[in-house]
Structures are given as structure tokens and as C-alpha cells.
Interface confidence: medium
């Protein structure tokens, strides 16, 4: 059954990076509008983007309450200019979503590296902890806070004068590389969850930062931090 | 297939010490945590301690810390639990198990039986 | 550390019977919570993580539910290979901490 003139959403998707969770669905809308609604397996339904005529719908407030548990989206078409009708007894067309859970399926935003700095022939490279939308007593956790040791960073790092590549890995959010004096280096971070079995394990590479260059400067006395 | 092969039954005196190994294969063994699990009749399964194949660094259960020292073998795949000061109470089998993304442990070795006794 | 009370201790029951488990947490572990299934002579298994998701492999007639504190997992039609003994475990706070088991025997 369903309602004259509508159809079903079809092409459910997930899209989600730190936890910013987009549910996107087809077709664009000709004279119909959608409601979504999500749950938990055990949870009650809960309705969002009230009679939209977009195709998609921001599900982060919802997932972010657990980011554990696994969701369920379902998309419903109403006949625009009809919402509100109240003599239908026919129930409007729906389709469900795939299964999503967030801590497993969320992909891993492009990390930045936030500082270097280099004290004789080491360097400390400074990952930047990504805020997400996840909440614990009120305040907004980071990555690192919610992967917790679930979540490595893999550093590439080579001389800017040569392309050979070195791969340095660390469980907190810091390298410390030994490098070799007089030469300046180029770096770049990937976060990786290594237990996930899926396409999703691993980030895009950083934006590439080099010694020499705005973020930082090879000095070879003393500290020197580059933040920005 | 991902397999993690323990070593053999332990027979051992009060005080002496041992280590058991547990050979992982099928997997990349620096992607996951290694766990050590106890079970015994009196206490069913009691968490020992993980250890990060890939970095070394190991956290314990405060109750193990005395007792059980974790290591492991890159070149091998190979994790080790090396236990000391070895009691009656100690005697139990002793599991490696590979922690999942979230915390549970998806894949047990098979158990390494250990017995104190005069 | 996390108090993982599992009841009841044995369960005697018939093939098609239906069973449940429960877990109580001596304080809230979200849904970080697993299930283990352990048969005479072997390791046990891993079936249900996240309260309610089961592991790869595992048949539908295991499910888990829960959040918080209180717990439950669920065979929904025993069959004879069901004999084992069944564990819950939160890995939400280390250390990780196992309920005592419940052990299920067939008629």
C-alpha cells in the first residue's frame, strides 16, 4: 500500500566523518516530501527533517547521544501540500535504512598536523586532536577521546630533497623521529583504526607541512614550537 | 583464517615461574590487542592484562600486576604472559585473546592449562 | 572495578525451549557489553558485543539487549549444541570484568 502519487526513497545512504552523520536517500522530490525517522533496536522511533524536500538528513544529534549502539533510519514520502491531511488511513511509503553504528562505520576525518619542532637531529610532530559532536557530562569529546587507544596516527615523513619515505606510528596524538642534521623533511599523518577490517580503517593523508616552511623552521638550538 | 596457537600444559612447583606463549597467524598481529584471560573453577574468567603488539606498552588488571608480565615478538607474531612467584591459587587455563575494535575479545587461543603442585 | 552479576547460575531446559540470561552491572556500562558462548573442552566464543550486535557467524536465535545496568540475552529455540556455558563481559571500563556464567544443560 502507500499514498497516491508518491514513492518510495530508494539509495539510502550513511555519511559520516567524526561522527557527523548525514542520511542521504533518492529520488529529488517531484510533488512529494519526506519525513525520517531513527531508532535503536530497542528504542522508540524518533522523527526528523519534518516534510523536507531535500535529500538528506542530519542524523548527528541522534547517533552522538551513543555512539555505540547501532541505528536504524527509515525515510517516508507524504504528498506535498498533503501533510497534514488526517482522512488517509494508508500508511505512506517508507524504506529502511542499512544498519549503522557509528563507532565502527564512521569514517575518519583528514587529520592535521598542528606543530613540529626540532631539537638537534629529533623532531616532535604534533598531531591535531579533532573535535567531534560526541558529548560526555557536557562537553564535546575529541577523537582520541572516544577511539581511545582503539585509534593510532601512522606519520610519513622524507627529506625534501629525496622521495624516500619513512612511516613512524604512535598510539597517543605525538612522534618523536630521529632525523638527520643539516636536512629538512617533509611530513605527513594518517589516522588509522587498525582493528577495522573495512575500507574505513584509515583516513586521507594530511595536508603535507615541511620544515622550512611557514609551520616550521629547522633550528638546531633550542626549542621551537609552530603552533597556528 | 585467523588462529592463535598457545603452547602446552604447565606442571610447576610453588615459586617457580613460567611463560606461555600464543603464536598468532591470519591476521595482522600489530592491528589488534593482545589480551590474557584466566578461568578458574572458583573465579570464572578474570582479565590479566592487554599488550599493544605494535608498541609494546601493556596495561594490567591492578589484581595481575604482581604477577603476570606481558611481552611480545614481532617477528614471530608471538605474544608471551610470564608468571612468577607461582602459587596453588595460579593453577587455571590460561587464554590469549585478540581484543575487537570496542573492546570484546572475537578470537581465543585454545588454553594452556597450568598446574602448581608440590 | 565493575561488578558483572549474572543469573541464574544453571538452566535446565528442553531442545525449542526459550532462554534468557540476564547481567546486571553494579554501574552503568552503556551497551559495552558481550556474550560468550563456552562448550565442554573449548575456548569460549565470542556471540553478541554492544549488547545487541551479533558477531559474524553467529545464528539469529542468540540476541542480546540492554543498556545502562540490566542486561538480557536470549535464545529464542534451544537446540542440543546449544550445551555450554554462557558469559557475559563489560569492556566498557578497564578492567574488563565477566559475569560467573550460566550454565545451560538439554534435557
Known amino acids: 500500500s502507500g499514498t497516491t502519487n508518491t514513492v518510495a526513497a530508494y539509495n539510502l545512504t550513511w555519511k559520516s566523518t567524526n561522527f557527523k552523520t548525514i542520511l542521504e536517500w533518492e529520488p529529488k522530490p517531484i510533488n512529494q516530501v519526506y519525513t525520517v525517522q531513527i531508532s535503536t533496536k530497542s528504542g522508540d522511533w524518533k522523527s526528523k527533517c519534518f516534510y523536507t524536500a531535500d535529500t538528506e538528513c542530519d542524523l548527528t544529534d541522534e547517533i552522538v547521544k551513543d555512539v555505540k549502539q547501532t541505528y536504524l533510519a527509515r525515510v517516508f514520502s507524504y504528498p506535498a501540500g498533503h501533510v497534514e491531511s488526517t482522512g488517509s488511513t494508508e500508511e505512506p511509503p517508507y524504506e529502511n535504512s542499512p544498519e549503522f553504528t557509528p563507532y565502527l562505520e564512521t569514517n575518519l576525518g583528514q587529520p592535521t598536523i598542528q606543530s613540529f619542532e626540532q631539537v638537534g637531529t629529533k623532531v616532535n610532530v604534533t598531531v591535531q586532536d579533532e573535535w567531534t559532536l560526541v558529548r560526555r557530562n557536557d562537553t564535546f569529546l575529541s577523537l582520541r577521546d572516544v577511539f581511545g587507544k582503539d585509534l593510532i596516527y601512522t606519520l610519513y615523513y622524507w627529506k625534501s630533497s629525496s622521495s624516500g619515505k619513512k612511516t613512524a606510528k604512535t598510539n597517543t596524538n605525538e612522534f618523536l623521529i630521529d632525523v638527520d642534521k643539516g636536512e629538512n623533511y617533509c611530513f605527513s599523518v594518517q589516522a588509522v583504526i587498525p582493528s577495522r577490517r573495512t575500507a574505513n580503517r584509515k583516513s586521507t593523508d594530511s595536508p603535507v607541512e615541511c620544515m622550512g616552511h611557514e609551520k616550521g623552521e629547522s633550528r638546531e638550538t633550542g626549542h621551537h614550537h609552530h603552533h597556528h | 583464517e585467523v588462529q592463535l596457537q598457545q603452547s602446552g600444559p604447565e606442571l610447576v612447583k610453588p615459586g617457580a615461574s613460567l611463560k606461555i606463549s600464543c603464536k598468532a597467524s591470519g591476521y595482522s598481529f600489530t592491528g589488534y590487542y593482545m589480551n590474557w584471560v584466566k578461568q578458574s573453577p572458583e573465579k570464572s574468567l578474570e582479565w590479566i592484562g592487554e599488550?599493544?603488539?605494535?608498541?609494546?606498552?601493556?596495561t594490567y588488571n591492578q589484581k595481575f600486576k604482581a604477577k603476570a608480565t606481558l611481552t611480545v615478538d614481532q617477528s614471530s607474531n608471538t605474544a608471551y604472559m610470564q608468571l612468577k612467584s607461582l602459587t596453588s591459587e595460579d593453577s587455571a587455563v590460561y587464554y590469549c585473546?585478540?581484543?575487537?575494535?570496542?573492546?570484546?575479545?572475537?578470537?581465543w587461543g585454545q588454553g594452556t592449562p597450568v598446574t602448581v603442585s608440590a | 572495578s565493575i561488578v558483572m552479576t549474572q543469573t541464574p547460575k544453571f538452566l535446565l531446559v528442553s531442545s525449542g525451549d526459550r532462554v534468557t540470561i540476564t547481567c546486571k552491572a553494579s554501574?552503568?556500562?552503556?551497551?559495552?557489553i558481550a556474550w560468550y558462548q563456552q562448550k565442554p573442552g573449548q575456548s569460549p566464543k565470542l556471540l553478541i558485543y554492544f549488547a545487541s550486535n551479533r558477531y559474524t557467524g553467529v545464528p539469529d536465535r542468540f540476541t542480546g539487549s540492554g543498556y545502562g545496568t540490566d542486561f538480557t540475552f536470549t535464545i529464542s529455540t534451544v537446540q542440543a549444541e546449544d550445551l555450554a556455558v554462557y558469559f557475559c563481559q563489560q569492556d566498557y571500563s578497564s578492567p574488563w570484568t565477566f559475569g560467573g556464567g550460566t550454565k545451560l544443560e538439554i534435557k
Open positions: 554501574q552503568s556500562v552503556s551497551n559495552g
Open positions: 599488550i599493544n603488539p605494535s608498541t609494546g606498552g601493556s
Open positions: 585473546a585478540r581484543r575487537e575494535l570496542g573492546g570484546p575479545f572475537g578470537y
